[in-house]
Amino acid sequence: ALDTNYCFSSTEKNCCVRQLYIDFRKDLGWKWIHEPKGYHANFCLGPCPYIWSLDTQYSKVLALYNQHNPGASAAPCCVPQALEPLPIVYYVGRKPKVEQLSNMIVRSCKCS
Amino acid sequence: ALDTNYCFSSTEKNCCVRQLYIDFRKDLGWKWIHEPKGYHANFCLGPCPYIWSLDTQYSKVLALYNQHNPGASAAPCCVPQALEPLPIVYYVGRKPKVEQLSNMIVRSCKCS
């Protein structure tokens, strides 16, 4: 699987999950989240050659098409597969609230 | 929806489904499919700005990150959303067989 266990410990050039830290204030311009100040969101990056964690029959066909037509703009793309929630603390007036923001952290990627 | 109805009749720059015809022999090197000789597979292409058919909370956050950090390599990607099957005819010996190849035709796209 193209997950954090494999991707963070390798120098994989192809589609893999990459490290990305997002600072809520600096990177998003958000002040409303009290805690955490930022989080390891990660992102997916890398080419999707034939036989590389291809998502569907279509992505397999497109990867094969791309092998035969390397200059073509039609190619599978490396996107999130498994996502995890992020617990946050924010304020409503003076009252702190704890919430889970769903689908916030990328754990693995796929070629779609 | 970023589907064929909208995308094929517009000059949309952002993520949309685009026309692509794949010839089984020429483009894939496949001789095993007897009919059809090729098909309109289509593909997804175009940037994914904030407020553009974003798939998850993560893709929205990443699009916002990208608006503030336009040079970053972390950005949502335009990928298939709705896929349709393709009926084909192939031979087993001298006997023709009809089969549905699932997830072969892109009908709409999303930013993931």
Partner: nanobody, 118 residues
């Protein structure tokens, strides 16, 4: 339930100016990410400009240097100052608010028509 009401649209000559306003009610306005989106005939809605609760703004390339987005959390309003308007800016302009909790949701106003023509 968040409600958004736009105002300030109208007919203007090329090179002219307009100021769009959006008033919000029914939510903690101070935490939402606000944006202006527009839809020209036969086109999808596109992002024009956005502004976060921390006053960070971003613009689509075609309006950079001409449009300015701002917000006032105490008055629960957002505005878009549009200068040097071009015929291609003709569209229905929508106010959009994204609230991120408890689950992400986009709220849209009804829209205000902007027509740039001589």
């Amino acid at each position: 339930q968040l409600q958004l009401v736009e105002s300030g649209g109208g007919l203007v000559q090329p090179g002219g100016s307009l100021r769009l306003s959006c008033a919000g009610s029914g939510i903690a306005f101070s935490r939402v990410t606000m944006a202006w989106s527009r839809q020209a005939p036969g086109k999808q809605r596109e992002l024009v400009a956005l502004i976060t609760d921390g006053n960070r703004s971003a613009y689509v390339d075609s309006v950079k240097g001409r449009f300015t987005i701002s917000r006032d959390n105490t008055k629960k309003t957002m505005s878009l100052q549009m200068n040097d308007l071009k015929p291609e800016d003709t569209a229905v302009y929508y106010c959009v608010a994204t609230d991120w909790v408890p689950t992400r949701r986009d709220y849209w106003g009804q829209g205000t028509q902007v027509t740039v023509s001589s």
